[in-house]
Structure formats: structure tokens, C-alpha cells
């Protein structure tokens, strides 16, 4: 099936041009999405093109500027946040990135009622995290690893924690590993629904080994960056959860929430916190061996001013075939009775589905079922549950939004998005206003993305929020590649693939093939989304065929495929890429002497192993920031899939699955190894060890490092990287420059 047909007709051919690398590097064909910043059931904020913050009321159709661009500009604000009582706005400036989600910034508070900035008791700088309470205008913020509270923006702060210390104790913010591999946020504090309580995590990294690397900068001597970073098997952070009454914070101080006994008996993680009411909270915990998760519902005891987590309110989720959950353990969405909840986990057939838990997990009522997966629960109201899945037409790489009426019996299911713009839109996400009165749908493709506003009761489209008209016009004279998503059936395994074909693709001709791989556990590369990127250019201008294949270990096709790689990373992911390549050769239009593979991060690991597989299939390949040994990567991620690197656990496979162990096999391929020297995530150590092994084996290879660049290789490095990789591939495929 052709998802994005090229609009080439002979009469037009001379007016149309191929994509250039410059187009890609300049972001000429990037698209826009529109996510309303909801502030009520029928109102949202949006930053206009001229940088005013505008409040829109859907019901009255009126809009007005709540904050002038003059005010934004006066502090060079790049972000804002309105207090729920609408009296204040925080303005964020001096953004300074730290890790994937974390950054520090300077915050200014603007008083909307008085039309001026708040002076007196100003916030310190730089702040690590700041947020409003859900009601009113209390402020919680983290400064120098400690948490502070303000009852009003102009009030003096109340210091909640005192033990915060750089790289040692983190309060209200995660350490490196919790940020990247567990919480996926820059914060670790949570307001209760009405702002009565503030829950927060404390991470103690005192005993964690430190990764140290040079940051060269411009000085005479490089700086050393030190990060407490637990690699597989190393000592982990110690986590504690506290809750403080924000109305009378000094009265009893922070109260620790007890850890379930079955969790506390050995190393464990805290995985998420969900407030249910102001006096009920739900915590999720995970054993270090990540196949057992416990959801614990705790209640505030007024008499003792403590939090009680009865065993009867502990719900265990266990996997016998792999790890608990998908990438993360799913979080509960509570219903209006404040005790029962909806949650996605594996059903008896091994597909992730929505379940309704009223008393015990064993008695859970399955809400969705089938040989597809429920992916996200967006919202539960009194009468509806909105979720996304890949059920429609059995394409795992699609996302549609569904509504289940839970108010009626039996519950009825309706696909909200399946037939809206069927050719253009097959991959959606949604953003809901309070009580799901209205919602925005954001369609990512396969056609040009479009964002629309809908009535939450009738699902009627109200208006288009963003349709990317400029992009559509800009693409009119571009020869885009053709894209098709199909599947291969091999030995009872379904391998979905996306093939990107040159605009004038002719099945009777032979084309060079580039495999783009990620392949990490619970990932998905074959998605029905729009993109004009580097591989689009390679197909459009350089005449390559590019293929992406979702093999074993990838997500949303059931546990059999997902958990196939459990404790065996680096085996089946590689096998499945090789199998797919052989199938592509059989199709007759691939020049089998010109096949390459490339990947980044986990994809760099897989591409390296594929190149070193000894099959002779690949002429060349590129690994960008690859993992080279699982002993070098983060404990939380690695151990989830590999267990521990100990003799009595899985040390043998840790050793067998390294890239270095296969150094000899790189002799007959052209290998380009690339890494940033300041990669905090996949440390440069990984590539340094590959290079050392190749040198020791006397194997020739090419390499490029990017000084002071992290895992993203951003800025000017991006341009250099893609230019360099393009030259490498063109040389490999004997394409003229």
C-alpha cells in the first residue's frame, strides 16, 4: 500500500525538484502541531505568531491577550505558566539544558491583576524546577536540590528540605538515571488535586559510582563532568517519598510514605505517583529485578498526620515471560469513586489491554481485547473512557483514538478518528480539556500533519487549529519519495517494514538499499507518520531504497514479540534485520552488492552487530553513539531486559553480546563509528572500546567524534554529521558527488 504517493506526472516533471541535503538541514519542510494549553473545560492559552499569550474561549468564540509580547520580551521569556487562579504568570528565561528533560532557568512572576512584575521575595536563580499548585497561586520550586514553597508569589519562601546537595541528595528532582530511565520527567514532586499536600521524592546518590568525562570548552584546561550514574549491576540510588501539608508546612513537616514490605525486602525503585484525592495517593514501586511491580494506595490519617498504606490496597503486577509493563509500567487512571481505576497491562493472551480494577488485580475486568494493543488512556470521565490503540485495520504502526461509553451497559466502543481523514491521518494523539468537554486531535500522518478541535460530547470537529498550509504549498514542487508499509511473515514472526522508494521507482531496476534501525525493546520504527528527513533525501535525490523493520523486541504487537529478547539483547533484533534484508533482495529491485545499515544509540548497537554478523550482506554501515557492551549502560534500563551481570544471573550473555567480541568480523565491511565526547547517556567509553578492539584486531575503520557534544549531536554538529554520513554512503554505493 502506498501511503504517500508522489505527485509526479510527466507534464510536471520538469518543474519539480528532488529534495536536497540543505532542505533537510535547514528544516525547510518541518511541520507544526497545535497543542492547546487547556486552562478550563472550554478555555485554552496559545502563543500567537507575534508572541502574545492569548486566551481562547471556545464557547463564546472570544479571545484576548492575557500577556503582551512586550512583557515576554522584557525578560526574554521562552516559556510561561499561568497560575490556576489566573492572577499570575511565571515567565521562564535563561534556559540552560542539563539532561534529556532537565534544565535550569530564571523565573519572573508577572501579576496579571496589577499589570506588573512581582517585586520583593524574588525567586533565586537558577531554579531547577518550578510549578504552580493546581488551585490558587501557591508555588513550589527546587533550588540547589532543595524544595521551597511560597503561599503567594510575593511571600517569603518556606524551605521544605535542607539536605539537598549537588550529585548527592536530590529533592523534588530526579537524579540522572531516574530522569532518563524511570520518570521521564525533570521533576519529582506532585501536588495533590486541590493543593493541600505536596508529595516529593528524595534520591540519595551518595554511594553511586560516578561517570567522569572531559568537557573541553575554550579554557586552557578541560572541565571534568561528574555524574552519579549506576551502570548495570552497580549500586543504585536510594529513594524515599515524603508528603508535606502545604497549608501548615511547619506543623508536622514532611511525612514519609511507607514502602510495601514485599518491595522493601530487596533493592527497589519508585516508578510513579498519582494523586487520587487530596487525602489519597497512589504510589508505584518496582523490584530491582523488574518483573514485579506493586501499586500501593495510601490514605491520610488525620489523627496521626501520617500516611497509611494498607496491604489490602496493594496491587501486584507480575510478568512471568519478561519484565513488568512495556517500556515503563503503566500508570493508573482513577475513576470517580476514588478507589477503582483503569490500567493497561497484559491479558492472558499476551496483549496489552485496558483493565478495570475494583478490588484485586485477579478480579480485574478486561475492557479492551484482541490481537492488538491499547496504548494510552487519555481521559476517564463519568461516562466515557478515551484511549488510543493500533486496532484499526490491523496496522500496528497506526494510532487511533477511541471512546468507550462506561456510563452505559454494556459499554459501547466508537473509533473517534478512524474515518476522519483516512488517507491523510492514521496516527493520532489527543489533548483533552477539563472533564473532556473539548479535545484537540493532533494527526502526525502519513499525510501532512493537521491539528483540529472537537466537541467532547458529539466528537464534532469545531475548527482546524493548524493545517500546515505553507508546508503543503512548499512541497508542491518537490519530488517526494514513495512510502509503503507492509509485512513479511517469517517462521511465525510478523516483520512489519516501511520502505521508502525513489520518486521514479521502477521495480525492474536495481537500487542500493539502506537499512535504518533502532530496534530497542518496546520501540517502534514502522509508524504511519509524516516525515521529510535525511532518509527522504537519500531516496529522493540519491536514488536509494531505505527500509525500516520492526523485529523481535519491538512494541505493540503482543508480548511474544516484545519479550522475545528478554535476557538476550543483541541476538534476535539483529537476526530479524538480516532476515528482512534477505527478503528484500528476493523482491528483485535491490542491488545486493550495495546494502548498508545505520542506526543511532540502540540502533548503533544493532547496526554494529549486523555488520559483524559475518553474513556478507552488508557492504558498509554507520553506528552513531552506539552501546557496545551492556555493562556500560544504565542499570535501570539494562537490567530491565538483561537481568544482572553476575555469574549466577546473566553475566555470560552480557559478555557474549558486546560489539568488541566481534571485532574480527568487521574486516570485510566499511564501518563508520561516530560519537559525541560529552555523551552523558551512552558514554563515549562505548565507542572508545569498539575502536580499541578494532585497532587490536588490526581492522581498518572510519571514525568521527564530536567534541563536547551529547547523545543528540545537536546544532552545527548535526549538519556536519549528516553531511559526513552522506559522503560515506555515496562512496560506499559508488554514487557520484
Amino acid at each position: 500500500i502506498v501511503l504517500r504517493p508522489s505527485r509526479v506526472h510527466n507534464s510536471e516533471e520538469n518543474t519539480m525538484r528532488a529534495l536536497t541535503l540543505k532542505d533537510i538541514l535547514n528544516g525547510t519542510f518541518s511541520y507544526k502541531t497545535f497543542f492547546p494549553n487547556w486552562i478550563s473545560g472550554q478555555e485554552y492559552l496559545h502563543q500567537s505568531a507575534d508572541n502574545n499569550i492569548v486566551l481562547y474561549n471556545i464557547e463564546t468564540g472570544q479571545s484576548y491577550t492575557i500577556l503582551s509580547n512586550r512583557t515576554m520580551k522584557s525578560v526574554n521569556a521562552s516559556n510561561y505558566g499561568l497560575s490556576p487562579d489566573r492572577q499570575f504568570v511565571y515567565l521562564e528565561s535563561d534556559y540552560s539544558k542539563l539532561w534529556r528533560y532537565s534544565y535550569t532557568a530564571t523565573y519572573y512572576i508577572y501579576d496579571l491583576s496589577n499589570g506588573e512584575f512581582v517585586r520583593g521575595n524574588e525567586l533565586p536563580r537558577p531554579i531547577q524546577y518550578l510549578c504552580w499548585s493546581p488551585v490558587g497561586s501557591k508555588l513550589a520550586y527546587v533550588y540547589q536540590n532543595n524544595i521551597y514553597l511560597k503561599q503567594r508569589p510575593g511571600d517569603p519562601p518556606f524551605q521544605i528540605t535542607f539536605n539537598g546537595r549537588e550529585n548527592k541528595i536530590f529533592n523534588g528532582i530526579p537524579d540522572w538515571v531516574y530522569e532518563e530511565e524511570m520518570l521521564a520527567t525533570k521533576y519529582a514532586l506532585w501536588w495533590s488535586p486541590n493543593g493541600k499536600f505536596l508529595a516529593y521524592a528524595e534520591f540519595n546518590d551518595t554511594d553511586i559510582p560516578v561517570i567522569a568525562y572531559s568537557y573541553y570548552g575554550d579554557e586552557q584546561y578541560p572541565r571534568t563532568i561528574n555524574i552519579p550514574y549506576p551502570k548495570a549491576g552497580a549500586k543504585n540510588p536510594v529513594v524515599r517519598i515524603f508528603i508535606i501539608d502545604t497549608t501548615y508546612p511547619a506543623y508536622v513537616g514532611p511525612q514519609e510514605v511507607p514502602v510495601p514490605a514485599m518491595i522493601a525486602s530487596s533493592d527497589y525503585y519508585f516508578s510513579w505517583l498519582t494523586w487520587v484525592t487530596d487525602e489519597r495517593v497512589c504510589l508505584q514501586w518496582l523490584k530491582r529485578v523488574q518483573n514485579v511491580s506493586v501499586l500501593s494506595i495510601c490514605d491520610f490519617r488525620e489523627d496521626w498526620q501520617t500516611w497509611d498504606c494498607p496491604k489490602t490496597q496493594e496491587h501486584i503486577e507480575e510478568s512471568r515471560t519478561g519484565w513488568a509493563g512495556g517500556f515503563f509500567v503503566s500508570t493508573p487512571v482513577f475513576s470517580y469513586d476514588a478507589i477503582s481505576y483503569y490500567k493497561i497491562f497484559s491479558d492472558k493472551d499476551g496483549y496489552k489491554h485496558i483493565h478495570y480494577i475494583k478490588d484485586t488485580v485477579e478480579n480485574a475486568i478486561q475492557i479492551t481485547s484482541g490481537k492488538w494493543e491499547a496504548i494510552n488512556i487519555f481521559r476517564v470521565t463519568q461516562d466515557s473512557l478515551f484511549y488510543s490503540s493500533n486496532e484499526f485495520e490491523e496496522y500496528p504502526g497506526r494510532r487511533n483514538i477511541y471512546r468507550i461509553s462506561i456510563g452505559s451497559y454494556p459499554p459501547s466502543k466508537k473509533c473517534v478518528t478512524c474515518h476522519l481523514r483516512k488517507e491523510r491521518c492514521q496516527y493520532y494523539t489527543a489533548s483533552f480539556s477539563d472533564y473532556a468537554k473539548y479535545y484537540a486531535l493532533v494527526c502526525y500522518g502519513p499525510g501532512i500533519p493537521i491539528s483540529t478541535l472537537h466537541d467532547g460530547r458529539t466528537d464534532q470537529e469545531i475548527k482546524i487549529l493548524e493545517e500546515n498550509k505553507e508546508l503543503e504549498n512548499a512541497l508542491k514542487n518537490i519530488q517526494l519519495p514513495k512510502e509503503e508499509i507492509k509485512k513479511l511473515e517469517v517462521d511465525e514472526i510478523t516483520l512489519w517494514y516501511k520502505m521508502i522508494l525513489p520518486p521514479q521507482f521502477d521495480r525492474s531496476k536495481k537500487y542500493p538499499l539502506l537499512i535504518q534501525v533502532y530496534g530497542g525493546p518496546c520501540s517502534q520504527s514502522v509508524r504511519s507518520v509524516f516525515a521529510v528527513n535525511w532518509i527522504s533525501y537519500l531516496a529522493s535525490k540519491e536514488g536509494m531504497v531505505i527500509a525500516l523493520v520492526d523485529g523481535r523486541g519491538t512494541a505493540f504487537q503482543g508480548d511474544k514479540l516484545l519479550y522475545a529478547v528478554y535476557r538476550k539483547l543483541g541476538v534476535y533484533e539483529v537476526e530479524d534485520q538480516i532476515t528482512a534484508v534477505r527478503k528484500f533482495i528476493e523482491m528483485g529491485f535491490i542491488d545486493e552488492k550495495r546494502i548498508a545499515i545505520w542506526g543511532w544509540s540502540y540502533g548503533g548497537y544493532v547496526s554494529s552487530l549486523a555488520l559483524a554478523s559475518g553474513t556478507g550482506l552488508f557492504k558498509c554501515g554507520i553506528a552513531v553513539a552506539p552501546v557496545s557492551s551492556w555493562e556500560y549502560y544504565a542499570s535501570v534500563y539494562t537490567e530491565r531486559f538483561m537481568g544482572l551481570p553476575t555469574k549466577d544471573d546473566n553475566l555470560e550473555h552480557y559478555k557474549n553480546s558486546t560489539v568488541m567480541a566481534r571485532a574480527e568480523y568487521f574486516r570485510n565491511v566499511d564501518y563508520l563509528l561516530i560519537h559525541g565526547t560529552a555523551d552523558d547517556n551512552v558514554h563515549f567509553q562505548n565507542s572508545a572500546q569498539i575502536a580499541k578492539a578494532l585497532v587490536n584486531a588490526q581492522v581498518d575503520f572510519q571514525a568521527m567524534w564530536y567534541s563536547d557534544q551529547n547523545h543528540g549531536l545537536s546544532g552545527l554538529s548535526t549538519n556536519h554529521l549528516y553531511t559526513h554520513m552522506t559522503h560515506f554512503l555515496k562512496q560506499c554505493f559508488s554514487l557520484s558527488d
Epitope: T65, D111, G115
Partner: antibody, heavy 124, light 113 residues
Framework: QVQLVQSGAEVKKPGASVKVSCKTS????????IHWVRQAPGQRLEWIGG????????NYNQKFKGRVTITVDTSASTAYMELSSLRSEDTAVYYC?????????????????WGQGTLVTVSS | DIVMTQSPDSLAVSLGERATINCKSS????????????LAWYQQKPGQPPKLLIF???TRESGVPDRFSGSGFGTDFTLTISSLQAEDVAVYYC?????????FGQGTKVEIK
């Protein structure tokens, strides 16, 4: 010349409410916040609260919170101050005044023009 | 709340003489970011609303005679009438607009001796 014209004097019984208006003219209404200040006999000036006409968001002195409501009608360039549960100590002259909105971080403005005042007498 | 205290409560000065009124705030009105003091002086004549004389502690409002001047910073401020005229008989108030609630001094009554 900028003008802030207030409604006339009122006599109210304890427990009642009073609503005073302040009609502005000859300036851009949305460039200034409107504030209400009162002056009881022989007392210092006392700030009651203010409002931003751009968004209708009020800010009240905690002392009056729950008893005072400040509103604006932008189309009429008029501000209102309603004080409820009146008591004898609320007898005062009530003034409205304008204050320029500070868009910039380093700005800050005083109340440059005032209404003529409205005498509110609370007596049984 | 910031408390504003004026001294003296009343002041009798001969025509053509200097009148000096002091105002003290319970916390600093100096804003470090722009080195400005958020203090204003008002004049109120009987039966009239207050009239703005000085803002930012020392900047004269347009149309205000230059015999009126303001000085001071932080917590201590002064309004000076260099040569008192008959029309200057009034009550003078200082006011802080550094933070909310806005607060006024108790007023200083200036009379002719």
C-alpha cells in the same frame, strides 16, 4: 485632560451593599489598571484593591477579601467597586485611581490620576 | 505588609521657608534590578482627591513646580518643599508601590506658620 468621574454619594444601612462606579475618559482604558482607595474621616489612605481591564482579573487587599468585588466594563471604560456587609467603620470617601500597566520588567508606576471621590455613609 | 511611617504628623512653616517631611518604610523599596525606589508622594487638599507629586522617590510628575523634590533610598525618604507657598497647604502622603498591598503613610499636615 484625563478624567475619572465617580458616582454620587450614598447612604447605606449596616449589612447592606454599595456599588460605586468610576467612568474614565480621554485615555486608553486598557493601558492602565484601576485601583480603589478609601479614606475614613481622619484616617490614612487605605488601598482596597485593583483590576486589570485587559483581563478583568482583580486583586484585593486581604483585609477586604470576601466583602469587596471589583469589576470592569471595558466597552464603557468604567470600573466598579462593590462593598458588602457594610458596617459603620466603612464610612469613608472612596476614590478610584489609575495606574499605568508595567509591561517591562524594570517598570513600575504610581497612581497618577484620581477620581473626585464618593462619600459612602453607613448609618442605621 | 509594608508599613509606612511619616514624621512629623504636622508641620508649620513660614512662607518662603523650607518644609521637610520624612517617610520610613518597614522594608526596603529599592529594587536591585533597576536601582529604583518604588515610592511616591501625594498632595491632598481639603475636599479634593490626592494629587501625584513625585514617583520613583525623586522624579517629579509633569506640571509639578520644581520647589518640590524627593530624595532617599531603601527605607528612608524625604519630601522637601524648598520655598513654601500658600497653595502648598495640604496633607502630604508617601506611598510604596514596591509590593502589594499598596500602603500609605499616615500623612503629614503642612500649615503656614
Amino acid at each position: 485632560q484625563v478624567q475619572l468621574v465617580q458616582s454620587g454619594a450614598e447612604v447605606k444601612k449596616p449589612g447592606a451593599s454599595v456599588k460605586v462606579s468610576c467612568k474614565t475618559s480621554r485615555y486608553t482604558f486598557t493601558e492602565y489598571t484601576i485601583h480603589w482607595v478609601r479614606q475614613a474621616p481622619g484616617q490614612r489612605l487605605e488601598w482596597i484593591g485593583g483590576i486589570n481591564p485587559n483581563n478583568g482579573i482583580p486583586n484585593y487587599n486581604q483585609k477586604f477579601k470576601g466583602r469587596v468585588t471589583i469589576t470592569v466594563d471595558t466597552s464603557a471604560s468604567t470600573a466598579y467597586m462593590e462593598l458588602s456587609s457594610l458596617r459603620s467603620e466603612d464610612t469613608a470617601v472612596y476614590y478610584c485611581a489609575r495606574r499605568r500597566i508595567a509591561y517591562g520588567y524594570d517598570e513600575g508606576h504610581a497612581m497618577d490620576y484620581w477620581g473626585q471621590g464618593t462619600l459612602v455613609t453607613v448609618s442605621s | 505588609d509594608i508599613v509606612m511611617t511619616q514624621s512629623p504628623d504636622s508641620l508649620a512653616v513660614s512662607l518662603g521657608e523650607r518644609a521637610t517631611i520624612n517617610c520610613k518604610s518597614s522594608q526596603s523599596l529599592l529594587y536591585s534590578r533597576n536601582q529604583q525606589n518604588y515610592l511616591a508622594w501625594y498632595q491632598q487638599k481639603p475636599g479634593q482627591p490626592p494629587k501625584l507629586l513625585i514617583f520613583w522617590a525623586s522624579t517629579r510628575e509633569s506640571g509639578v513646580p520644581d520647589r518640590f523634590s524627593g530624595s532617599g533610598f531603601g527605607t528612608d525618604f524625604t519630601l522637601t518643599i524648598s520655598s513654601l507657598q500658600a497653595e502648598d497647604v495640604a496633607v502630604y502622603y508617601c506611598q510604596q508601590y514596591f509590593s502589594y498591598p499598596l500602603t500609605f503613610g499616615q500623612g503629614t499636615k503642612v500649615e503656614i506658620k
